[in-house]
Structure formats: structure tokens, C-alpha cells
């Protein structure tokens, strides 16, 4: 009956952690004697190729300084206790502790048997490092030029993490990769870039980080912060202002970041009706007269700049009953 070596084609281990490289001789055959078990790294330099051996009488040996005896152990293999019992070498699983990047590579597990001869199996050990992720908004100011408004950083991953963004905005991403402080790891930084405008302020975008150490992608929401001058509109005019009307109000509606620091009401004609009283963002009209046949201007200031809106007022002789509607205010 033929025997075979059962190994995993690939084993993944966490950088700094412990990994087991399974290796079993199957099936159990009466009279099949395992005289030696060895682990080798065929791709390593000649003096580092022999990683471990298990001699039924002498037990385990770990000759190479890398990984070295302090980081290697046979999980189940047992040497004979004195001369009366046979060594148990069918399970040659090797444990590797304190994984380093240099440990990555091919490992060959070999059983020297009698009478079948030597049989071997090869495992590829991949050393991975789970990255630490963070994302943050960059406080930016309104501009005509593309600017980084959010950063997503995946630190010290192996292999490098893949970063993408989920957003309905018009954006592009710029990615950089640098070596991590841990040897063999990579820190990936993705910059979410757009032309910063008020439309982007307060919008939540999502950084998506994918890595083989994650069961599912990491999704990190980021709320954008764009400083921009006030965007102003005026509400309250219902096209039914008539002489003598007493319940009219204009509101200066503003979107801005940061908050407005001042409101200024004026008219394009230069004359300002005395019955119109500015109360911050509101213009309260006590009584409509002919001076209201003008264009009102609301100018709003914040730390970034200013914005303005105009509202043309048409004063009627009598109320427009055909399209009676609610007054603004």
C-alpha cells in the first residue's frame, strides 16, 4: 500500500504569532517504519535549508539559526522512551513561534520510511499582518483646486491593504504606500480628493479597507468638513405684497461653515424703507409702502468670506386675491 504525506498547500500565520505547519504520513501501515522526519526550506540559502529533524531515538533537532530552536517545536512527534517503545512520528506537524517576515516561503516535510523510501510534501507559509485602520476628515477651505478632504490610513499590513471609497460625490483617490515600522509591513494611505465646495460639507463618505486577515471589509464613515463662505438665499416673498400690508417678513437663509458672523440688509436703490427692521437674519416689515418697490439684498459674512442674495419686490395697489397664499415670515 502506497503512503503519502498530507500537508496543506498554503498556511497563513500572523506576524509575531504562532503557526502550525501540519504534516502527517497516511495511511497507517503495519510494519512501515519511519526512520527520520525532516523539515527543509528548499529555497533558503544552503546553510539555512535544514530547519528541523526528528530522530526516533534522539528526538528533535533544529540546526539552523533561522528560525532556530527557540522558535520551533514539533507538536506531536514523540521519541521512544528508552528502548522499549517505538517513536510516534506519523504526525510531524511543526510549530513556528514569533513569526517574522523571513519565515515566509516553502517548507518541505519529509518522512524517511522503510521499506517505502522517502516521501515528502510541501507547504507554502505566508506571513500576514493585520493592519490597523483609521480615517479622518481634513478641515479644508473652499477652493477651486482639487484638495484632500479625507484620509484613510491602513497601517502595517502584510500584504498591503486595498483601500477604496464609497461616495456619490465627484471625487478621486490618490494612494501612497510606505514601509511600516514593522519589517515587511506596508502602510497604505488613500487621499479622498475633490474640489472643496459647500456641497461637500457635512457629507459622509465611507472608506472601505479590504485585507485577507479581515473576515469582511472594514467600513469607516467620515463626515467631510469644508469651510466655505455663506451660500445665501432669501425667502418670504409671496408675490402678494400690497400697500399697507403689515405681516410681511423676509428671511435670509444661509448655509455656511463656519457659522455666519454677521447679516447686513440693504437695497440696490440705496434707500431703505423705515418700516423695515433688520433683526439678524430676518427683515421684519411693519407696513408695506411704495418704497418697497425695490430689490432687497442680504449680505452674510463668516470667517471665510461673504455671500449675498437679492430679492426683487413688486408692490401691488391691492391684494392679489386670485393666488392668495400664505405670507412668508
Amino acid at each position: 500500500q502506497d503512503v503519502r504525506v498530507q500537508v496543506l498547500p498554503e498556511v497563513r500565520g500572523q506576524l509575531g504569532g504562532t503557526v502550525e505547519l501540519p504534516c502527517h504520513l497516511l495511511p497507517p501501515v503495519p510494519g512501515l517504519y519511519i526512520s527520520l522526519v525532516t523539515w527543509q526550506r528548499p529555497d533558503a540559502p544552503a546553510n539555512h535549508q535544514n530547519v528541523a529533524a526528528f530522530h526516533p531515538k534522539m528526538g528533535p533537532s533544529f540546526p539552523s539559526p533561522k528560525p532556530g530552536s527557540e522558535r520551533l517545536s514539533f507538536v506531536s512527534a514523540k521519541q521512544s522512551t528508552g528502548q522499549d517503545t517505538e517513536a510516534e512520528l506519523q504526525d510531524a506537524t511543526l510549530a513556528l513561534h514569533g513569526l517574522t517576515v523571513e519565515d515566509e516561503g516553502n517548507y518541505t516535510c519529509e518522512f524517511a520510511t522503510f521499506p517505502k523510501g522517502s516521501v515528502r510534501g510541501m507547504t507554502w507559509l505566508r506571513v500576514i499582518a493585520k493592519p490597523k485602520n483609521q480615517a479622518e476628515a481634513q478641515k479644508v477651505t473652499f477652493s477651486q483646486d482639487p484638495t484632500t478632504v479625507a484620509l484613510c490610513i491602513s497601517k502595517e499590513g502584510r500584504p498591503p491593504a486595498r483601500i477604496s471609497w464609497l461616495s456619490s460625490l465627484d471625487w478621486e483617490a490618490k494612494e501612497t504606500q510606505v514601509s511600516g515600522t514593522l519589517a515587511g509591513t506596508v502602510t497604505v494611505t488613500s487621499r479622498f480628493t475633490l474640489v472643496p465646495s459647500g456641497r461637500a460639507d457635512g457629507v459622509t463618505v465611507t472608506c472601505k479597507v479590504e485585507h485577507e486577515s479581515f473576515e469582511e471589509p472594514a467600513l469607516i464613515p467620515v463626515t467631510l468638513s469644508v469651510r466655505y463662505p455663506p451660500e445665501v438665499s432669501i425667502s418670504g416673498y409671496d408675490d402678494n405684497w400690497y400697500l399697507g400690508r403689515t405681516d410681511a417678513t423676509l428671511s435670509c437663509d444661509v448655509r455656511s461653515n463656519p457659522e455666519p458672523t454677521g447679516y447686513d440688509w440693504s437695497t440696490t436703490s440705496g434707500t431703505f424703507p423705515t418700516s423695515a427692521v433688520a433683526q439678524g437674519s430676518q427683515l421684519v416689515i411693519h407696513a408695506v409702502d411704495s418704497l418697497f418697490n425695490t430689490t432687497f439684498v442680504c449680505t452674510v459674512t463668516n470667517a471665510v468670506g461673504m455671500g449675498r442674495a437679492e430679492q426683487v419686490i413688486f408692490v401691488r395697489e391691492t391684494p392679489n386675491t386670485a393666488g392668495a397664499g400664505a405670507t412668508g415670515g
Epitope: P30, S80, E86, S118
Partner: antibody, heavy 116, light 107 residues
């Protein structure tokens, strides 16, 4: 401790047979193969074959297969190697040996001289 | 069968010398090679197994190297008690085969 004690020297005529014994002690006889290796005077080592006392399975070097029989008697923990049709080039020291990783335990050797 | 060709057949060296014996396999045997030392009138003793692993109790002046088809036994500083014959053996494939031996003489 493990011991392999072989039978004494033999002088044989060409064409005859010789049967060398190897008595084992100090371990579970049925758990290990007993191998036979020979060494002609002033020459190298040559593997002849082996027996597994646990199930009497045997394994031979093709060179000797037609002339050799290796057996084991578990009741006495003794292995035997019988070589027939002897010729002068079979003159050698014959060793029984126990494979524990390598050939770690050896009998003291039995000198077989084939001479007319 | 796999042939194990050993060289030289005889080696004469002085105490303190570094000496090497080589063994060439007729086909790839991995690292499945043993080196034995045999003194006159005695059975062989294991020095090195799996090509480079020193056997228990063997002085560290003995070392082995190689894989595939080419193997070397090195004695870093020859001692008088190293007078013996040295054999390589492959256990990669049945039947086991031995080199023809290297007789080491002390000058």
C-alpha cells in the same frame, strides 16, 4: 539496553547454505525491522534485506532475492538470515542491525568464510 | 539502485588537519544520507544523519553538508582517535546503498 547477539563464525563450501542467527533483547522485538548488512574483507558495506517480526514481512535487495531468506521467531526474539548457493565472493562479516533512525544498534558480526 | 560514489578511497592526514570526504549519489537523494565511522573489528557507528545533523555524543569537529547528489563529511581538526574507515549511506530509496568507504590514516 538493546543487544543483538549473533551466532558464531561459519566456514562453508561453495554451493552450500549458511544460516546466521541474531538474538535481540532490551526492546519490543515485534516493533522494529531487523536488517542484515554484510562486509567482505577490506570492502564496503552492502545491505541484504530485512524482516519485520511483527508480521513476518520481509524486504530484500534484488541482488540477493533469489538466494536469501530472512525470518524471525517472535517466541525467542531471534532473527535469521539464510543465504544459499554460496560462492567465494560471499565471504564476509554478516551483521544484523536495528534501524532506529539510522542503523544504531549492531550485532557483533558473524564471519562466514566460503572456501573449497 | 542508487550508487554512492565515495572519494577518496584512502586519505592520509596529520593531527590537527582539516579533512573532507565526499560522496556522490547517482540520483537525487534529498538529504537522506548518513555518515558512519567504523574502526577495525567493530560495527559502524553513526556520526551524521540527514546529511548535516550530528548524532548524539559525536564531537563537534565532525560536520556534514550537502543535499541532492553531493555530500561532504568534514573533520575540522583531525585527532588520533579518528583513525577509521568512513562510509556514507543513502536511505532515500530502497534498497539502502553505501559508499565503498574512505580509509583515514594518520601521518
Amino acid at each position: 539496553q538493546v543487544q543483538l547477539v549473533q551466532s558464531g563464525a561459519e566456514v562453508k563450501k561453495p554451493g552450500s547454505s549458511v544460516k546466521v542467527s541474531c538474538k535481540a533483547s532490551g526492546y519490543i522485538f515485534t516493533s522494529y525491522w531487523i536488517h542484515w548488512v554484510r562486509q567482505p574483507p577490506g570492502k564496503g558495506l552492502e545491505w541484504i534485506g530485512a524482516v519485520y517480526p511483527g508480521n513476518s514481512d520481509s524486504n530484500y535487495n534484488q541482488k540477493f532475492k533469489a538466494r536469501v531468506t530472512i525470518t524471525a521467531v517472535t517466541s525467542t526474539s531471534t532473527a535469521y538470515m539464510e543465504l544459499s548457493s554460496l560462492r567465494s565472493e560471499d565471504t564476509a562479516v554478516y551483521y544484523c542491525t536495528k534501524l532506529v533512525g539510522t542503523f544504531d544498534y549492531w550485532g557483533q558480526g558473524t564471519t562466514v568464510t566460503v572456501s573449497s | 539502485d542508487i550508487q554512492m560514489t565515495q572519494s577518496p578511497s584512502t586519505l592520509s592526514a596529520s593531527v590537527g588537519d582539516r579533512v573532507s570526504v565526499t560522496c556522490k549519489a547517482s540520483q537525487n537523494v534529498g538529504i537522506n544520507v548518513v555518515w558512519y565511522q567504523q574502526k577495525p573489528g567493530q560495527p559502524p557507528k553513526t556520526l551524521i544523519y540527514s546529511a548535516s545533523y550530528r548524532y548524539s555524543g559525536v564531537p563537534d569537529r565532525f560536520s556534514g553538508s550537502g543535499s541532492g547528489t553531493d555530500f561532504t563529511l568534514t573533520i575540522s581538526s583531525l585527532q588520533a582517535e579518528d583513525l577509521a574507515e568512513y562510509f556514507c549511506q543513502q536511505y532515500n530509496t530502497n534498497p539502502f546503498t553505501f559508499g565503498q568507504g574512505t580509509k583515514l590514516e594518520i601521518k
